[in-house]
């Protein structure tokens, strides 16, 4: 079989900024890692920034995570909570282009969803979203 | 339809699962009008960190 990457990049989307977190193979040490749905491919999810008033633009820094070269799991050095969210969009049709971040359909839908979440979770604690995956309903 | 799966990140202690879900559900009507996205079947769960990609995914099929 042909090879794709063993690591991938996800984008944390937030107001006016994108904090990029790279997933790497377990043997590597990385200061900040978010597991990706695309863990065997080099795909980077396109980041999206919403336009906000300068006064309300919130530049977030993501607390570092530490990991070791051992098989043990990395530990949080400062606190970030992650939530897995799943939902159906009943008025859209899945097609194969939603498996590829370089397609227009994927990018448009990702952009709308990113904007939507920035609207929903305006409070200061929101760091962003990552690992968007689309599948047929 | 399209199923969307994603991970949300918050500073620890600023929100819980229930509030994540509640706020999202409250926004569904506006999502339909603003983005033309008709949202249903919302499911939210904690992702224990660190987590494996596999366990992260298989919880939700």
């Amino acid at each position: 079989a042909s090879g794709s990457a063993s690591g991938s990049a996800s984008t944390l989307v937030h107001n006016g900024t994108s904090a990029r977190a790279t997933t790497t193979p377990a043997s590597k040490s990385t200061p900040f890692s978010i597991p990706s749905h695309h863990s065997d491919t080099p795909t980077t999810l396109a980041s999206h920034s919403t336009k906000t008033d300068a006064s309300s633009t919130h530049h977030s820094s993501v607390p570092p995570l530490t990991s070791s070269n051992h098989s043990t799991s990395p530990q949080l050095s400062t606190g970030v909570s992650f939530f897995f969210l799943s939902f159906h969009i009943s008025n859209l049709q899945f097609n194969s282009s939603l498996e590829d971040p370089s397609t227009d359909y994927y990018q448009e839908l990702q952009r709308d969803i990113s904007e939507m979440f920035l609207q929903i979770y305006k409070q200061g604690g929101f760091l962003g979203l990552s690992n968007i995956k689309f599948r047929p309903g | 339809s399209v199923v969307v799966q994603l991970t949300l990140a918050f500073r620890e202690g600023t929100i819980n699962v229930h509030d994540v879900e509640t706020q999202f559900n409250q926004y569904k009507t506006e999502a339909a009008s603003r983005y033309n996205l008709t949202i249903s079947d919302v499911s939210v769960s904690d992702v224990p960190f660190p987590f494996s990609a596999q366990s992260h995914h298989h919880h939700h099929h």
């Epitope: 079989a1 042909s2 090879g3 794709s4 991938s8 990706s36 749905h37 695309h38 863990s39 065997d40 491919t41 080099p42 795909t43 899945f94 097609n95 194969s96 282009s97 498996e99 590829d100 971040p101 370089s102 397609t103 227009d104 995956k133 599948r135 047929p136 | 494996s52 990609a53 596999q54 995914h57 298989h58 099929h61």
Partner: antibody, heavy 117, light 107 residues
């Protein structure tokens, strides 16, 4: 390492059907798409269709609609392609290619189908 | 259907040469183009995805670029293992289509 292992070569008679498999391994997720592509002897590549593993979602090239059926078995991480009403021009190597965060990321080794009376 | 016109259909080159293969798309496909490598008896391998992104494990001598509707695969310094057939593939719209292929042979 991600691998796509396809079933062995087939020799079939004109008018018959053939069903081939594409088993994926080395990947943690059960949700992804499989594209099917064929290559006739000495020719280029031709897209047949797509199935999202574990669902009944399919897309077909109009040229093959009605003769091709794509199915999958999530528990076996396997996709299947059945081609019916075979004719000599269907003699080809049939490839599966799976998505891995983007389309056509990994390819199987191919299944040679020979249509001969 | 979107047509991909790939040129040349074959070329002879020597180790160390710079090789350029072009695909022209009949309609706008954005960046939704892959480059594939096929060697006899081996699985097809994707080299480039999304026009210019290099797959992991693919040597950096391979690169992809775009100018309007023309998409180019460049091998900066041809190596013995690069003698193969190369295909472009568009996935902007179904049915997905391939270029006719370019066979790179030893001069």
């Amino acid at each position: 390492e991600v691998q796509l292992v396809q079933s062995g070569a087939e020799v079939v008679k004109p008018g018959a059907s053939v069903k081939m498999s594409c088993k994926t391994s080395g990947y943690t997720f059960t949700s992804y798409g499989i594209n099917w592509v064929r290559q006739r002897p000495g020719q280029g590549l031709e897209w047949i269709g797509y199935i999202y593993l574990g669902s009944d979602y399919t897309e077909y090239n109009e040229k093959f609609k009605g003769r091709v059926t794509l199915t999958s078995d999530t528990s076996a991480s396997t996709a299947y392609m059945e081609l019916s009403s075979l004719r000599s021009e269907d003699t080809a190597v049939y490839y599966c290619a799976r998505s891995a965060g983007s389309l056509f990321g990994y390819w199987g080794q191919g299944t040679l189908v020979t249509v001969s009376s | 259907d979107i047509q991909l016109t790939q040129s040349p259909s074959s070329l002879s080159a020597s180790v160390g040469d710079r090789v350029t293969i072009t695909c022209r798309a009949s309609q706008d496909i954005g960046i939704t183009l892959n480059w594939l490598q096929q060697k006899p008896g081996k699985a097809i391998k994707r080299l480039i995805y999304a026009t210019s992104s290099l797959d992991s494990g693919v040597p950096s001598r391979f690169s992809g670029s775009r100018s309007g509707s023309d998409y180019t695969l460049t091998i900066s310094s041809l190596q013995p293992e690069d003698f193969a057939t190369y295909y472009c593939l568009q996935y902007a719209s179904s049915p997905y289509t391939f270029g006719g292929g370019t066979k790179v042979e030893i001069k």
